[in-house]
């Protein structure tokens, strides 16, 4: 009689996370009598996965009915595979005894787990920046395997080229993470812009994952001010308007000063929105000319989004 061989026909098996892995093993003889055990890894630290003789292995089922006469198929199925299950699995024949002793091992089957990357998370700078400044965005995705992955950056559908990407760890691992930083130059038109991080991986079947960041969270467009004097509305009254244009975000406070003294403070409320997403607002001040002997310096002072105030002045002539 030929000596028993343990045959593991698959050198490697690749399974998507969450699925079941079937690990094939057959023996070529009924002799010697004794159980089959499955291990992950080799040597003294190997991990018992299944023991035909005894134990409780809730995730493992035998593929064939191992109690049936002349059964030589000891393939197993492991359910709900996770990246932590990756490794080399050995089917080992034991010889009956007290205790049973290891008789022969199969060559092993390497199980690799295809882990889907997590949804990319894009984060921008902590503080807002103004047009013409360069800001950095980061994109992170975790838990994927194998290591090969493609990451692209887009701004409004246009691919970006100024970015750096790292995949960790560098060596072998059950799963990997990707981290990328892209540099984006802001323009005044970016309130409605989006930055997109796109991740492509073998587990996604050609359907990449995307993470987005709205530049509206990042950009600050400072206002332009224009102070104008309107025709006299009534005797001794002049209407002065302050046009606050093209600002973003909306948070804005305006103060009128007459000769340096605070006349009125108000917060932007009824704004109008421009096509590019910025806002316009107008404030007006009625000045009683008869109350002034000399010329009046009117100043429109605007504090936008917590930034230092900007102002525009207008000299109101008081005729004798």
């Amino acid at each position: 009689e030929e000596e028993l061989q343990v045959i593991q026909p698959d050198k490697s098996v690749s399974v998507a996370a969450g699925e079941s892995a079937i690990l094939h093993c057959t023996v070529t003889s009924l002799i010697p009598v004794g159980p089959i055990q499955w291990f992950r890894g080799a040597g003294p630290a190997r991990e018992l996965i299944y023991n035909q003789k005894e134990g409780h292995f809730p995730r493992v089922t035998t593929v064939s009915e191992s109690t049936k006469r002349e059964n030589m198929d000891f393939s197993i199925s492991i359910s709900n595979i996770t990246p932590a299950d990756a490794g080399t699995y050995y089917c080992v024949k034991f010889r009956k005894g007290s205790p049973d002793t290891e008789f022969k091992s199969g060559a092993g089957t390497e199980l690799s787990v295809r882990g889907k990357p997590s949804a990319p998370v894009v984060s921008g700078p902590a503080a807002r920046a103004t047009p013409q400044h360069t800001v950095s965005f980061t994109c992170e995705s975790h838990g994927f395997s194998p290591r090969d992955i493609t990451l692209k950056w887009f701004k409004n559908g246009n691919e970006l080229s100024d970015f750096q990407t790292n995949v960790d760890p560098v060596g072998e691992s059950v799963s990997y993470s990707i981290h990328s930083t892209a540099k984006v130059v802001l323009t005044r038109e970016d309130v409605h812009s989006q930055v997109i991080c796109e991740v492509a991986h073998v587990t996604l079947q050609g359907d990449p994952l995307r993470g987005t960041a709205n530049l509206s969270e990042t950009i600050r467009v400072p206002p332009t001010l224009e102070v104008t004097q309107q025709p006299v509305r009534a005797e001794n009254q002049v209407n002065v308007t302050c046009q606050v244009r093209k600002f973003y975000p909306q948070r804005l406070q305006l103060t009128w000063l007459e000769n340096g003294n605070v006349s009125r403070t108000e917060t932007a409320s009824t704004v109008t929105e421009n096509k590019d997403g910025t806002y316009n607002w107008m404030s007006w001040l009625l000045v009683n000319v008869s109350a002034h002997r000399d010329d009046v310096k009117l100043t429109c002072q605007v504090e936008h989004d917590g930034q230092p105030a900007v102002s525009k002045s207008h000299d109101l002539k008081v005729s004798a």
């Epitope: 009689e1 009924l30 002799i31 009598v33 004794g34 159980p35 023991n51 035909q52 003789k53 005894e54 134990g55 009915e65 191992s66 109690t67 049936k68 006469r69 002349e70 059964n71 009956k96």
Partner: antibody
């Protein structure tokens, strides 16, 4: 280690039934066949039947097919052999035995249960 | 049904001598490349103990003075050098179909 612990001796009257138990330990009960064998005083071994606890598949010796019933309780890893319509020539030691190689052989044996049938 | 007939019914052998027990099947017990014959030893007051499986393979812990041979219908259990502790009744069993036992051979010391 594998152990098969059988229930105690029984004395039964002719026509009665007996149910012998065999509690298994030291191995996964559902992974191996259990055989039942009897031995009348001073006589040889006689195979009665076998059961696969994983699915309750049974095979019976034709001689016992109408009188013997094998069952298992997987929650307690216990096998049972019930023999009905007892006669005096059913007096014997009844053994359970575990088949470790699925070869329809008997690798590990219980110590036996003496069933005496007497009026 | 396959019937197994053992011979002799009883046997007396001197210590250190060879003991041979035969088992003949009423039809071949060979199937799938294996001879489905098993040998058991039973000492008084004890359950049987498996000695040989599939005609020629010693079970674990069985001394190597015990050996099994044969094919098809004729099988032999040999004890190469009889020891006092080998006094017992020996049974063959087949499982080519559903199991049956031979009638047993009583081995004593001469």
């Amino acid at each position: 280690q594998v152990q098969l612990v059988q229930s105690g001796a029984e004395v039964k009257k002719p026509g009665a039934s007996v149910k012998v138990s065999c509690k298994a330990s030291g191995y996964t009960f559902t992974n191996y066949w259990i055989n039942w064998v009897r031995q009348a005083p001073g006589q040889g071994l006689e195979w009665i039947a076998m059961i696969d606890p994983s699915d309750s598949e049974t095979h019976y010796n034709q001689i016992f097919k109408d009188r013997a019933t094998l069952t298992t309780d997987t929650s307690t890893s216990t096998a049972y052999m019930e023999l009905r319509s007892l006669r005096s020539d059913d007096t014997a030691v009844y053994y359970c035995a575990m088949d470790y190689g699925s070869l329809y052989a008997m690798d590990y044996w219980g110590r036996g249960t003496l069933v005496t049938v007497s009026s | 049904d396959i019937v197994l007939t053992q011979s002799p019914d009883s046997l007396a052998v001197s210590l250190g001598e060879r003991a041979t027990i035969n088992c003949r099947a009423s039809q071949s017990v060979r199937s799938s490349g294996y001879n489905w014959i098993f040998w058991y030893q039973q000492k008084p007051g004890q359950p049987p103990k498996l000695l040989i499986y599939l005609a020629s393979n010693r079970d674990s812990g069985v001394p190597d003075r015990f050996s099994g041979s044969g094919s098809g219908t004729d099988f032999t259990l040999t004890i190469s050098s009889l020891q006092a502790e080998d006094v017992a009744v020996y049974y063959c069993q087949h499982s080519r179909e559903l199991p049956t036992f031979g009638q047993g051979t009583k081995l004593e010391i001469k």
